[in-house]
């Protein structure tokens, strides 16, 4: 495969990775698998710093993350460890809310519009924010 | 000129399998992902599968789902679905199409038939 | 899976007539939807995407409108090359889904 040097168009560059931001609403599935048809992931949130970044780029407005507990614990799409890494949880989130009435809990986390984190319906048709590291092999399969 | 040019149809028995091509031109082929989409004699149109610019992620119809196989060489601009297990139900006119940022199809090619039957 | 459902099916009109075409998603797609024109024997061509975005190089007499789950395609004034049939498609959510068509003929 071939490596990414540089960040596509309309993606924005910082700390070695490229960041796409979404103008429009998906549920959390649905935008895991556009960041993936990117050859992205959904953001995975590492440090204060990318936070900030973020959070700078997003403004006040409900955005989703990589992050989920759909499977029981807590998990970033990437595979970053969740329970040694960063974490900006709204007070008393995540709180797998069932009042809401939609049926279940809140399995998804998403930027709430202060930038700190809550966990919320995975259906909801929030924005997103896909991200793609620079300088990984592009994973181009070998044809058969 | 941006182009995309399908290759590979013809007549098959149920059972069968069969390889589409895609020829792509004009346009930077492995920054886009790419799609198949199909349309049966005097019917509408139906999203098969799509693949990402790199080809590391992939997904499908139910209706295929196991049965074919979308791919792409990115080094000769082209891309590519494999077919097989084929039914009565498979025939029709198979286009490729790149796919946008907003989720839709931009430039499609002429298409090319498949049909299915004994 | 998105069902998307058109009206009318098919529609007989003249030239320079105001031609309206609706699709509804049964659920909401917000703006995810663009809708295709084909002729026969031809490859569909996007007139518009995001709901109500022109593609480049379409006639502006083509508009779009809606968001949620009901959409409207628009002609505003029908030219001789405009009789095709009409498709929308939503890309909001796997799998993407056609509608079933609208074939816009001569009165």
């Known amino acids: 495969g071939s490596e990414r040097t540089c960040c596509p168009v309309n993606w924005v560059e910082h700390e070695r990775s490229c960041y796409w931001f979404s103008r429009s609403g998906k549920a959390w599935a649905d935008a895991d698998n556009y960041c993936r048809l990117e050859d992205a992931h959904l953001v995975v949130v590492t440090s204060w710093e990318e936070q900030k970044f973020v959070q700078h780029h997003i403004g006040p407005v409900n955005t989703w993350m990589g992050l989920h507990d759909q499977n029981g614990p807590w998990k970033w799409v990437d595979g970053t460890d969740y329970e040694t890494g960063f974490k900006n949880w709204r007070p008393e989130q995540p709180d797998d809310w069932y009042g809401h009435g939609l049926g279940g809990g809140e399995d998804c986390a998403h930027f709430t519009d202060d930038g700190r984190w809550n966990d919320d319906v995975c259906q909801r048709p929030y924005r997103w924010v896909c991200e793609t590291e620079l300088d990984k092999a592009s994973q181009e399969p070998p044809l058969l | 000129e941006v182009q995309l040019l399908e290759s590979g149809g013809g007549l098959v028995q149920p059972g069968g399998s069969l390889r589409l091509s895609c020829a792509a031109s004009g346009f930077t082929f492995s920054s886009y992902a790419m799609s198949w989409v199909r349309q049966a004699p005097g019917k509408g149109l139906e999203w098969v599968s799509v693949?990402?610019?790199?080809?590391?992620?992939?997904f499908y119809a139910d209706s295929v789902k196991g049965r074919f196989t979308i791919s792409r060489d990115n080094s000769k601009n082209t891309l590519f679905l494999q077919m097989n297990s084929l039914r009565a139900e498979d025939t029709a006119v198979y286009y490729c199409?790149?796919?946008?940022?907003?989720?839709?199809?931009?430039?499609w090619g002429q298409g090319t038939m498949v049909t299915v039957s004994s | 899976d998105i069902q998307m459902t058109q009206s009318p099916s098919s529609v007989s009109a003249s030239v320079g007539d105001r031609v309206t075409i609706t699709c509804r998603a049964s659920q909401g797609i917000i703006s995810w939807l663009a809708w295709y024109q084909q002729k026969p024997g031809k490859a569909p061509k996007l007139l518009i995407y995001?709901?109500?975005s022109l593609q480049s190089g379409v006639p502006s007499r083509f508009s779009g409108s809606g968001s949620g789950t009901d959409f409207t395609l628009t002609i505003s004034s029908l030219q001789p090359e405009d009789f095709a049939t009409y498709y929308c498609q939503q890309g909001n959510s796997f799998p993407f889904t056609f509608g079933p068509g609208t074939k816009v003929d001569i009165k």
């Open positions: 693949i990402s610019g790199s080809g590391g992620s992939t």
């Open positions: 199409a790149k796919r946008t940022p907003e989720d839709v199809f931009d430039i």
């Open positions: 995001a709901a109500s």
